[in-house]
């Protein structure tokens, strides 16, 4: 059984079948003798009880108030009352877009990653038994699909799949033809999944320096938005007043990832700064990656093969 209409604010398009189902339906069956009433109020008009005589377009079935179809003048507040139970809805009926097969206010947007599973299923459980046929349109052009009862698209997404998909259910009621439209705006995007962050450049870097001078060690990484990049050095970070971590710089790549750079500035280089590891680490949910810098005196350069040097 179709479950109840829980949302208190509802917007529908003129000319379509529509229903309100109260949320104490199971309870209502248990106390069938109880008086159950539907009311409408709009503007200055106070509560007016609804019954099939109110309008040829209105039908009452057990727990449901049906509109065949809903029209602009049905806008207003609706109430269901039974004993001490009341449920209220605010109904807003909007104009149909005459220039399109759907109304923009009634669109459900979904973003799907390319190559990921993508599906459109045209179903309407409440009106299922009354539906003669259902058509699926893409950007208001009918798609030729095998199943005309519940047309479905199930595939791995491609960029060409992007567009507005409208399921149009055609149904008969009291000799009249009606249709109900449900539209999805499907956007296909690049893979959004996280990358394994990587530090750029060699893992071990010897940097030639002169005592008393300054040096800037640049650590760069390609990472995800929530990943962090930091420096580790000495017994306790920050114990050397001559060592400063500069503010991290980040630039977003076209793929939606980040290029980050963090500089470690060492001023007035002393003997204590030589031949120790300055480690730069990038940390993510998937683990860490570290690269190391070692400061060596320019005079000692000859002892180290040229290919391990960084300026």
């Amino acid at each position: 059984a179709e479950s109840c209409t829980s949302r208190p604010h509802i917007t529908v398009v003129e000319g379509e079948p529509f229903y309100l189902k109260h949320c104490s339906c199971s309870l209502a069956h248990e106390i069938e003798t109880t008086t159950k009433s539907w009311y409408k109020s709009s503007g200055s008009q106070e509560h007016v009880e609804l019954n099939p005589r109110s309008s040829s377009r209105i039908a009452l079935h057990d727990c449901v108030l049906e509109f065949w179809p809903v029209e602009l003048n049905d806008t207003g507040s609706y109430f269901f009352q039974m004993k001490n139970y009341t449920q209220k809805w605010k109904l807003n009926v909007i104009r149909r877009n005459k220039h399109s097969c759907f109304t923009e206010r009634q669109v459900t947007s979904k973003i799907v990653e390319v190559k990921k599973f993508f599906q459109i299923t045209c179903e309407n459980s409440y009106y299922q038994t009354l539906v003669n046929s259902t058509s699926l349109y893409k950007n208001c052009k009918k798609l030729l699909l095998e199943n005309n009862k519940n047309p479905t698209i199930k595939k791995n997404a491609e960029f060409e799949d992007q567009g507005y998909y409208s399921c149009v259910h055609f149904l008969h009621h009291n000799g009249k033809l009606f249709n109900i439209t449900k539209t999805f705006n499907i956007t296909i995007v690049e893979d959004r999944s996280n990358i394994v962050p990587v530090l750029l450049g060699p893992k071990l870097n010897h940097v030639a320096v002169e005592l008393g001078k300054n040096v800037r060690l640049n650590c760069s990484a390609l990472l995800n938005e929530e990943d962090v990049i930091y420096w580790m050095f000495g017994e306790e970070n920050g114990s050397d007043p001559n060592i400063h971590e500069e503010k991290e710089m980040r630039i977003m790549t076209p793929e939606g990832k980040w290029h980050a750079s963090k500089v470690l500035r060492i001023e007035n280089i002393g003997e204590s700064n030589l031949n120790v590891l300055y480690n730069c680490t990038v940390a993510s949910t998937g683990g860490t990656d570290t690269k190391s810098f070692i400061l060596v005196r320019k005079a000692d350069m000859a002892d180290i093969p040229g290919h391990v040097f960084t300026r």
């Epitope: 179709e2 479950s3 109840c4 209409t5 829980s6 949302r7 208190p8 604010h9 917007t11 949320c23 923009e104 206010r105 009634q106 669109v107 459900t108 947007s109 979904k110 973003i111 599906q119 299923t121 705006n185």
Partner: antibody, heavy 121, light 111 residues
Framework: QVQLVQSGAEVKKPGASVKVSCKAS????????MHWVRQAPGQGLEWMGT????????YYNQKFQGRATMTVDTSTSTVYMELSSLRSEDTAVYYC??????????????WGQGTTVTVSS | EIVLTQSPGTLSLSPGERATLSCRAS??????????MHWYQQKPGQAPRLLIY???NLETGIPDRFSGSGSGTDFTLTISRLEPEDFAVYYC?????????FGQGTKLEIK
């Protein structure tokens, strides 16, 4: 009338995972979208992602992509949010909340009571 | 991603005064006559509460001293005459596109 009831508070160690549940009562579960919003102590609201119970479609805030997983059990009208590789910054109150499925109706008129997740070693 | 910026960060007023809170979006959140901007109130230890939906519609049960206005990128929440229970944090939220997003909040405090 409409209620969202969340699971109880959790205390987790860094690196662990947490799974929070949210049970919906008395309403059209599959025609509404379910969302997760978190709030760190003294901070603002942060939208984590959403699930459409009708087809299990999910969309995550990029910040939580790959770390958050939202699932649904339509037989019990329950949605779940699992967050992995927890760190201290994930200490927050996690709310489930519901909206309509149309873009215009994706505002949150019903909220769960919140689940406090504390990440501490 | 649409970024929402609320101002001021904190607003100090007295009961009875008029409060005007602003929310600016990094791109338009309006389409076909509708503005997909919503406002919430949150008090300490409580879940947020919907006040205004679609820029100007008052949620059921919310006092009519609350009103919302604006379109495109600029939106305003107005409280015509502050009551003691109105002092709280207020958030705007957009639903024009995924990912959905909130503003950072405006704290309304008693002067």
């Amino acid at each position: 009338q409409v209620q969202l009831v969340q699971s109880g508070a959790e205390v987790k160690k860094p690196g662990a995972s947490v799974k929070v549940s949210c049970k919906a009562s008395d309403y059209t579960f599959t025609s509404n979208w379910m969302h997760w919003v978190r709030q760190a102590p003294g901070q603002g609201l942060e939208w984590m992602g959403t699930i459409d119970p009708s087809d299990s479609y999910t969309y995550y805030n990029q910040k939580f992509q790959g770390r958050a997983t939202m699932t649904v059990d339509t037989s019990t009208s329950t949605v779940y949010m699992e967050l992995s590789s927890l760190r201290s910054e994930d200490t927050a109150v996690y709310y489930c909340t519901t909206s309509g499925d149309y873009d215009a109706d994706r505002y949150f008129d019903v909220w769960g009571q919140g689940t406090t997740v504390t990440v501490s070693s | 991603e649409i970024v929402l910026t609320q101002s001021p960060g904190t607003l100090s007023l007295s009961p009875g005064e008029r409060a005007t809170l602003s929310c600016r979006a990094s791109k338009s959140v309006s389409t076909s006559g509708d503005s997909y901007m919503h406002w919430y109130q949150q008090k300490p230890g409580q879940a947020p509460r919907l006040l205004i939906y679609l820029a100007s519609n008052l949620e059921t049960g919310i006092p009519d001293r609350f009103s919302g206005s604006g379109s495109g990128t600029d939106f305003t929440l107005t409280i015509s005459r502050l009551e003691p229970e109105d002092f709280a944090v207020y958030y705007c939220q957009q639903s024009r596109e995924l990912p959905l997003s909130f503003g950072q909040g405006t704290k309304l405090e008693i002067k």
